[in-house]
């Protein structure tokens, strides 16, 4: 089965790598523009130069192309806790990330929010915090895991999801209550 190609891909596949087919004359293959530049004018004829211009400030192209405009630089989302790791250049988009001891939680394919890595207080680190994964904690006896934080079993009430993890403590509380009645 031949994969379906869009018009642009079909046109490009006629020319050798690094070239594209002239939009007005399909017998001419023009050289693509280098990264950091964009197509200002198609080459006038075979073997003649494509007119490429450097991207202006605030825009970029990260690969060879025949785009009529450079792409706008991304802005890091401060409201998501993002910080700029590296600034936008003519040939590379802004790189955004999180601060030290934070991880990325992706709400969608391209949008992430920064959250603090769990410290595993009242527990031990089972797996260290990573770029896209919070620390995995194992809690000490008398504590249960809630949103990846170790919480005292004294905060556990019957019928909550912690009861199995805090079973001895729950039973002790029950025993104390029972012993108080005659």
């Amino acid at each position: 089965l031949v994969p379906h190609l869009g018009d642009r891909e079909k046109r490009d596949s006629v020319c050798p790598q690094g070239k594209y087919i002239h939009p007005q004359n399909n017998s001419i293959c023009c050289t693509k523009c280098h990264k950091g530049t964009y197509l200002y004018n198609d080459c006038p004829g075979p073997g003649q130069d494509t007119d490429c211009r450097e991207c202006e400030s605030g825009s970029f192209t990260a690969s060879e192309n025949h785009l009529r405009h450079c792409l706008s630089c991304s802005k890091c989302r401060k409201e998501m806790g993002q910080v700029e790791i590296s600034s936008c250049t003519v040939d590379r988009d802004t790189v955004c990330g999180c601060r030290k001891n934070q991880y990325r939680h992706y709400w969608s394919e391209n949008l992430f929010q920064c959250f603090n890595c769990s410290l595993c207080l009242n527990g031990t680190v089972h797996l260290s915090c990573q770029e896209k994964q919070n620390t995995v904690c194992t809690c000490h006896a008398g504590f249960f895991l809630r949103e990846n934080e170790c919480v005292s079993c004294s905060n556990c009430k019957k019928s909550l999801e912690c009861t199995k993890l805090c079973l001895p403590q729950i039973e002790n509380v029950k025993g104390t209550e029972d012993s108080g009645t005659t």
Epitope: Y103, H105, Y106, W107, F115, S118, Q130, K132, Q133, N134, V136, R146, E147, N148, L160, E161, C162
Partner: nanobody, 120 residues
Framework: EVQLLESGGGLVQPGGSLRLSCAAS????????MGWVRQAPGKGLGWVSA????????YYADSVRGRFTISRDNSKNTLYLQMNSLRAEDTAVYYC?????????????RGQGTLVTVSS
């Protein structure tokens, strides 16, 4: 057993408003981030909005920011989504979901959904 029951969906004209509610049970509601995901006809699931357990931190998708407001009442174990200035592209099944932070899938439970149709 975790249960999430949505209500409040329906047919509304463009520019109109709706308020979705989600009644939660089977877990300690106030401990967890909760949110709304939606699935438009023929499209995948996507996060609309989410709110932390205390209500102090929120997330909104760019497409709904300024039009939708998420809130919660921990004493009633209920999550809300106030939707204003509705558009045809907001037509979708809206699901209440318990957010799973920390990596991997974005939610560990979701409800059966409520249909929102924006049409004149």
């Amino acid at each position: 057993e975790v249960q999430l029951l949505e209500s409040g969906g329906g047919l509304v004209q463009p520019g109109g408003s709706l308020r979705l509610s989600c009644a939660a049970s089977g877990f300690t509601f106030g401990w967890y981030w909760m949110g709304w995901v939606r699935q438009a006809p023929g499209k995948g699931l996507g996060w609309v909005s989410a709110i932390s357990g205390s209500g102090g931190s929120t997330y909104y998708a760019d497409s709904v920011r300024g039009r939708f407001t998420i809130s919660r009442d921990n004493s009633k174990n209920t999550l809300y989504l106030q939707m204003n200035s509705l558009r045809a592209e907001d037509t979708a099944v809206y699901y209440c979901a318990k957010v799973k932070l920390g990596g991997g899938p974005n939610f560990d439970y979701r409800g059966q959904g409520t249909l929102v149709t924006v049409s004149s």
